[in-house]
């Protein structure tokens, strides 16, 4: 569209230049040309001449009517056919937009990634609006009643320096566009409860050459949080189903987790952690691929007949991947849980 145009007349839109998608729209063109009594007034949409639903109201004015206009954006202009002129003469032009009022923002979540110095809030915006929509994030201290507001397009990062007067806040998001305004539900936030530990990383893995080979996975984090609860999921690259083990971790030293895995197979490992007792998880770490060594002796391998890792807390569950090509986007589809206990020899309790 053309933002600035010298008009020789006027163009206006009913109900307005921004309107709800699917509405009936009338666009008027009124010429004010010198030395021209136009034979015809023409409408163009995105450069193409319109043929239908045009009404000549009087000598200077014409109207085009659209039933259920549903294009998000269009550039309209109108011209006059002046006697004695070879070309049509431009009268005026307008950018028009159609869209929807915003949905109420949903699933508002605020977290502080350790060491980031920011509180990051995200939300679901709902269905597309097709028009410029802004989000106003309200952060109100429950202790001082002071309110801060931040403009955003899809998420917001708020410096924790500006949240020093209080630990408890009420957060909500207001969605605003030309067609309406909606508020999210309010979220109660305690700054101490929303910290996500510094990223956990799997650094290496090795498989021992024992008669019953075991794989040791080494993983670490720079977190300063003392009590951390973690999950490690793993599967063969050919499998859809993840197994998940749970650990209480202390990152003052590198974590070692032992697995008894199928020989001569390529495995994918990922880990994620949260502060113990809190609800916000890290995203899963980058996939770490490890190839187990070939079987040395003839052994009938069974996935659940081997001792588990020797860790303080562990749970193994089956998790099925939606797609083997999307290791980061997995959903818990089944919930068969196997609890491992520190084993002596090959004895295994399953409860």
């Amino acid at each position: 569209g053309i933002t600035s145009i010298n008009c020789s007349g006027d163009m206006w839109v009913e109900p307005g230049e921004i309107f709800q998608m699917g509405m009936n729209v009338s666009i008027y063109c009124q010429e004010a040309l010198k030395h021209c009594r136009p034979r015809n007034l023409y409408f163009y949409k995105n450069g193409f001449k319109e043929e239908f639903d045009i009404t000549r109201i009087n000598r200077t004015t014409a109207r085009i009517w659209y039933k259920g206009f549903s294009e998000p954006h269009a550039y309209m202009h109108c011209t006059a056919e002046c006697p004695g002129h070879f070309q049509e003469t431009l009268i005026c032009g307008k950018d028009i937009s159609s869209g929807h009022p915003p949905d109420a923002p949903s699933n508002l979540t605020c977290v502080i990634y350790e060491y980031s110095g920011n509180m990051t809030c995200t939300w679901n915006t709902g269905k597309p609006t097709y028009i410029d929509t802004k989000y106003i994030v309200h952060v109100k201290s429950l202790e001082t009643e002071e309110e801060q507001q931040y403009l955003a397009s899809s998420y917001v990062k708020i410096s924790t320096d500006s949240l020093q007067g209080s630990r408890k806040y009420l957060v909500w998001v207001q969605a605003v566009n030309s067609l309406g305004m909606e508020n999210s539900q309010q979220l109660h936030v305690h700054l101490d409860d929303i910290v996500i530990p510094s990223a956990s990383i799997i650094s290496r893995a090795e498989t021992t050459n024992d008669t019953v080979p075991k794989t040791i996975v080494y993983w670490k984090s720079k977190t300063m949080i003392e009590k951390v609860f973690c999950e490690m999921r793993y599967k063969t690259t050919t499998n859809q189903t993840w197994s998940v083990k749970e650990f209480d971790a202390n990152f003052t030293y590198v974590q070692q987790s032992e697995f008894y895995l199928e020989p001569d197979s390529k495995y994918v490992f990922q880990v994620r952690c949260q502060e113990t007792g809190k609800r916000n998880w890290q995203p899963w770490s980058s996939p770490f691929v490890h190839q187990t060594s070939q079987e040395t002796g003839k052994r009938n391998w069974q996935p659940w007949s081997s001792p588990f890792v020797h860790q303080t807390s562990q749970t193994v569950s089956q998790v099925t991947a939606k797609s083997s090509h999307e290791p980061q986007k997995m959903e818990m589809l089944s919930a068969t849980i196997f609890r491992g206990h520190p084993a002596s020899g090959n004895h295994q309790d399953i409860g």
Epitope: I136, E147, Q148, Q149, Y150, L151, A152, S162, V176
Partner: nanobody, 116 residues
Framework: QVQLQESGGGSVQAGGSLTLSCTAP????????MRWVRQAPGKGLEWVSG???????IYADSVKGRFTISKDNAKNTLYLQLNSLKTEDTAMYYC??????????GSQGTQVTVSS
């Protein structure tokens, strides 16, 4: 309640420009989100523009591309630059706390009159 004070209004021809200011003694603009609202003769209050503590801005469609909101934290002052003024911009202009809303907190306002 913060006492806000607007200034800079006046009479101008259509197509002309003005800059409105809003100050508040003892008020820290650095952390504040602010807005401008206006009231045309015989009409209700209309939200015009807003700015958050970090300088992100939002505008009503009727003024987008013509008006610019800004603030100078060092001078504790909020501004509204009005360009390409139209007769329909004639109104009393008020500043208020908060990015968005068609209310103000009882300040005196500043009058803008645009003639054709």
């Amino acid at each position: 309640q913060v006492q806000l004070q607007e200034s800079g209004g006046g009479s101008v021809q259509a197509g002309g420009s003005l800059t409105l200011s809003c100050t508040a003694p003892g008020f820290t603009f650095r952390l504040a989100a602010m807005r401008w609202v206006r009231q045309a003769p015989g009409k209700g209050l209309e939200w015009v523009s807003g700015i958050d503590s970090r300088g992100s801005t939002i505008y009503a469609d009727s003024v987008k591309g013509r008006f610019t909101i800004s603030k100078d934290n060092a001078k504790n002052t909020l501004y509204l630059q009005l360009n390409s003024l139209k007769t329909e911009d004639t109104a009393m202009y008020y500043c208020a706390q908060g990015v968005y809303g068609d209310t103000y907190s009882g300040s005196q306002g500043t009058q803008v009159t645009v003639s054709s």
